[in-house]
């Protein structure tokens, strides 16, 4: 899996999107987890509604929300009031039984200031950014 970088500004909200094949993952709940080290499990932050048909309902855990468009095939995670310690490596997961498939690896970066972006010469807007080597980033 390539890693997609999402950059947000401290104190603001950041929306992370994870596209997936809606047919392949039909009937599966989704989750958002945080990788706390090179090895070790991905620590669950929040998961979609226990009833798959209600996956469109937004579920919160603290300042993190998850909602799933099961027809369109897009999982959306919202990080509200972003703080520096929210930065890290995360995964969007598709759950089946006790197993989990990785839909997308996401690197969340929290900047002190929008102009702290690595290409600060250009005006930058929060969200997905441009491409770095093996990390994929989109505007």
């Amino acid at each position: 899996h390539n890693t997609t970088v999402f950059q947000g500004v401290a104190g603001q909200s950041l929306q992370v999107s994870c596209p997936y094949d809606s047919m392949k993952h039909w009937g599966r709940r989704k989750a958002w987890c945080r990788q706390l080290g090179e090895k070790g499990p991905c620590q669950r932050v929040v998961s979609t509604h226990n009833l798959w048909l209600l996956s469109f309902l937004r579920r919160w855990n603290g300042s993190t929300a998850i909602t799933d468009d099961t027809l369109g095939g897009t999982l959306t995670i919202t990080l509200r009031n972003l703080q520096p310690h929210d930065a890290g490596l995360y995964q969007c997961q598709s759950l089946h039984g006790s197993e989990a498939d990785t839909l997308r690896k996401v690197l969340v970066e929290v900047l002190a200031d929008p102009l702290d972006h690595r290409d600060a010469g250009d005006l930058w807007f929060p969200g997905e950014s441009e491409s770095f080597e093996d990390a994929h980033v989109e505007h």
Partner: antibody
Framework: ELQLQESGPVLVKPGASVKMSCKAS????????MNWVKQSHGKSLEWIGV????????SYNQKFKGKATLTVDKSSSTAYMELNSLTSEDSAVYYC??????????????WGQGTLVTVSA | DIQMTQSPSSLSASLGERVSLTCRAS??????LSWLQQKPDGTIKRLIY???TLDSGVPKRFSGSRSGSDYSLTISSLESEDFADYYC?????????FGGGTKLEIK
């Protein structure tokens, strides 16, 4: 063994620039944030800024914006900090301090030995 | 910016004594606080993170606790190598800020 080896002491003239280094070893350099901290003689510590070596993204303490520039060289696992337009106020020991996995969510577990910068005519 | 008010600024104590240092945060930091030890040669070592989690290899005589916006570092029985400078660090929000430090000296 994890090590952060900082460059040696420097004596520079007012108005000049200085670029110090912090060579990391014993871990995957791009997986961990790198912070820089200033300690003036007999004073407390001040956070300058942080860089994510994987993407090069930086965040600075507003106080050091325009004064410090953080960069990395992934090929040599080295972080750099350049200070410009030096004055006597910039005379201090500067530390690099490694963060946690793609973040600083547990603070700064590892510190370099510090680089002494003396600004004097 | 979040101000970290550290007290006392200096402390004289004897070997075997129990001492406590405190940092008060001017805003909520939700436990995102660590304690650092700086030896006279400038070497800095993290002792505690997340307010109360002891770093591996740090003696158990060190402990961290929280009461509201007050964070404490306690050394239960001072040993000779504990005489050093101590700083708290908040990493809850930018810019990260340090306490003014406590100089722990031998009585």
């Amino acid at each position: 063994e994890l090590q952060l080896q900082e460059s040696g002491p420097v004596l520079v003239k007012p108005g000049a620039s200085v670029k110090m280094s912090c060579k990391a070893s014993g871990y995957t350099f791009t997986d961990y944030y790198m912070n820089w901290v200033k300690q003036s003689h007999g004073k407390s510590l001040e956070w300058i800024g942080v860089i994510n070596p994987y993407t090069g993204a930086t965040s600075y303490n507003q106080k050091f914006k325009g004064k410090a520039t953080l960069t990395v060289d992934k090929s040599s696992s080295t972080a750099y900090m350049e200070l410009n337009s030096l004055t006597s106020e910039d005379s201090a020991v500067y530390y690099c301090a490694r963060g946690t996995y793609y973040s600083n969510y547990e603070g700064f577990p590892y510190w370099g030995q510090g680089t002494l910068v003396t600004v004097s005519a | 910016d979040i101000q970290m008010t550290q007290s006392p600024s200096s402390l004289s104590a004897s070997l075997g004594e129990r001492v406590s240092l405190t940092c008060r945060a001017s805003q909520e930091i939700s436990g995102y606080l660590s304690w650092l030890q700086q030896k006279p040669d400038g070497t800095i070592k993290r002792l505690i993170y997340a307010a109360s989690t002891l770093d591996s290899g740090v003696p158990k005589r060190f402990s961290g606790s929280r009461s509201g916006s007050d964070y404490s570092l306690t050394i239960s029985s001072l040993e000779s190598e504990d005489f050093a400078d101590y700083y708290c660090l908040q990493y809850a929000s930018y810019p990260y800020t340090f306490g003014g430090g406590t100089k722990l000296e031998i009585k």
